[in-house]
């Protein structure tokens, strides 16, 4: 995701209200949650904490030599976490899903 | 990676010469290869071919409503391929790695 060029790739808070994105029509609770986001740049040299793939390292080195040829690697979620939600099923019955996968960022990295 | 806003997230060619990135000091062959890159935007609605995670969908919806609050999801490699390389060991002996992982983009997606 986008981020200030001055900061390196990291996880930051992103409060999401389900009403804002139109999901309140089927998600009863929670009303909002922290999805987090991955923000910041993938600068040379890529640190171990951004768990770069070999391709990300190669792309970073190419960008360093030819900035107009290719962009930097991108700071993205590399591991996601589930949240628990109470939602309305097809018949409008409130149903609990303990593990609604991939909703929140657990880790960010350069890809 | 970066990309023209007019095109959607896709895999494009990126020829990498190992001499350009300083890896010719240990990689004997190949001299160059296609690393590919992921280029283009992650626009609403995210298509199935960019295999969006739930988090990417949420982030896209938040960006749609509050463009300054959070950026769009990013077009990145979601699957990488290996290449075979011939490299010099510490003693300068040419050695083959049949399956040098994560060097080339196989698939791109919005994350």
């Amino acid at each position: 995701s986008t981020g200030a060029a001055s900061s390196h790739c990291q996880k930051t808070s992103l409060r999401v209200n389900f009403e804002d994105i139109g999901w309140d029509s089927w998600i009863i609770a929670p009303k909002e949650y922290d999805a987090y986001e991955c923000k910041g740049g993938c600068f040379f040299p890529l640190a171990d904490d951004v768990t770069p793939t070999k391709h990300a390292i190669v792309q970073t080195l190419v960008h360093l030599k030819f900035p107009t040829k290719v962009g930097k690697a991108c700071c993205v979620p590399t591991k996601l976490s589930p949240i628990s939600i109470l939602y309305k099923d097809d018949m409008g019955v409130p149903t609990l899903k303990y593990h609604y996968e991939g909703m929140s960022v657990a880790e960010c990295g350069c890809r | 990676s970066t990309g023209a806003a007019s095109s959607h997230c896709q895999k494009t060619s990126l020829r990498v010469n190992f001499e350009d990135i300083g890896w010719d000091s240990w990689i004997i062959a190949p001299k160059e290869y296609d690393a590919y890159e992921c280029k283009g935007g992650c626009f609403f609605p995210l298509a199935d071919d960019v295999t969006p995670t739930k988090h990417a969908i949420v982030q896209t919806l938040v960006h749609l409503k509050f463009p300054t609050k959070v950026g769009k999801a990013c077009c990145v490699p979601t699957k990488l391929s290996p290449i075979s390389i011939l490299y010099k060991d510490d003693m300068g002996v040419p050695t083959l790695k049949y399956h040098y992982e994560g060097m080339s983009v196989a698939e791109c997606g919005c994350r």
Epitope: - | P30, K31, Y33, S81, P82, V93, L96
Partner: antibody, heavy 114, light 110 residues
Framework: EVQLVESGGGLVKPGGSLRLSCAAS????????MSWVRQAPGKGLEWVGR??????????DYAAPVKGRFTISRDDSKNTLYLQMNSLKTEDTAVYYC?????WGQGTLVTVSS | QSVLTQPPSASGTPGQRVTISCSVT????????VHWYQQLPGTAPKLLFF??YRPSGVSDRFSGSKSGTSASLAIVGLQSEDEGYYYC???????????FGGGTKLTVLG
């Protein structure tokens, strides 16, 4: 000079076991990814499996016909590669080569027969 | 049936040019990674060509090329000592290791 010397081949009954060794010299063995490749009598080359260097996790991968029966290991202090072969079948009869991909040993013959 | 298809045999007279082909018939194999081995009678295989790299001791009479889904090994100025088997090898991504072609037996006539 790079040298790879296999040993441990011989005659074994179906269902039996055998351990092959490969003594390496002339290169940085500990950093090398090492493979075993076999060649049945009068046939072509067939990859058996590979072990990565310990610094890269020491992961092993195997060809489908030997998976679950063969195990590759290495002892970097002895510059030696091993291939433990269990539940041997007649179709495992072959000359077994250890290789870095660039350099190959002379091979050792394994015959599985009752 | 190998996923790398080679002709079972090839032949030529001394001094001639001979080409051995290797065709990829599996999407798990990228032609980019295909390389060549030589196995002379009664000896272990030897790396002949890897991309544009020819190991020391390998004659410059041997050269490799790739086009589409096919790789080729060319031998110019054929000599009797070139007689043996030639194998192409590629990286099988699914298998996570090399896969070999069936091999081509090269015979030097006369």
């Amino acid at each position: 000079e790079v040298q790879l010397v296999e040993s441990g081949g011989g005659l074994v009954k179906p269902g039996g076991s055998l351990r092959l060794s490969c003594a390496a010299s002339g290169f940085t063995f500990s950093n090398a990814w090492m493979s075993w490749v076999r060649q049945a009598p009068g046939k072509g080359l067939e990859w058996v499996g590979r072990i990565k260097s310990k610094t890269e996790g020491g992961d092993t991968d195997y060809a489908a016909p030997v998976k679950g029966r063969f195990t590759i290991s290495r002892d970097d202090s002895k510059n030696t590669l091993y291939l433990q072969m269990n539940s041997l079948k007649t179709e495992d009869t072959a000359v077994y080569y250890c290789t870095t991909g660039t350099y190959w040993g002379q091979g050792t013959l394994v015959t599985v027969s009752s | 049936q190998s996923v790398l298809t080679q002709p079972p045999s090839a032949s030529g007279t001394p001094g001639q040019r001979v080409t051995i082909s290797c065709s990829v018939t599996n999407t798990d194999i990228d032609i980019f990674n295909v390389h060549w081995y030589q196995q002379l009678p009664g000896t272990a295989p030897k790396l002949l060509f890897f991309h544009d790299y020819r190991p020391s001791g390998v004659s410059d009479r041997f050269s490799g090329s790739k086009s589409g889904t096919s790789a080729s090994l060319a031998i110019v100025g054929l000599q009797s000592e070139d007689e043996g088997y030639y194998y192409c090898a590629g990286l099988d991504e699914a298998m996570r290791g090399p896969v070999f072609g069936g091999g081509t037996k090269l015979t030097v006539l006369g």
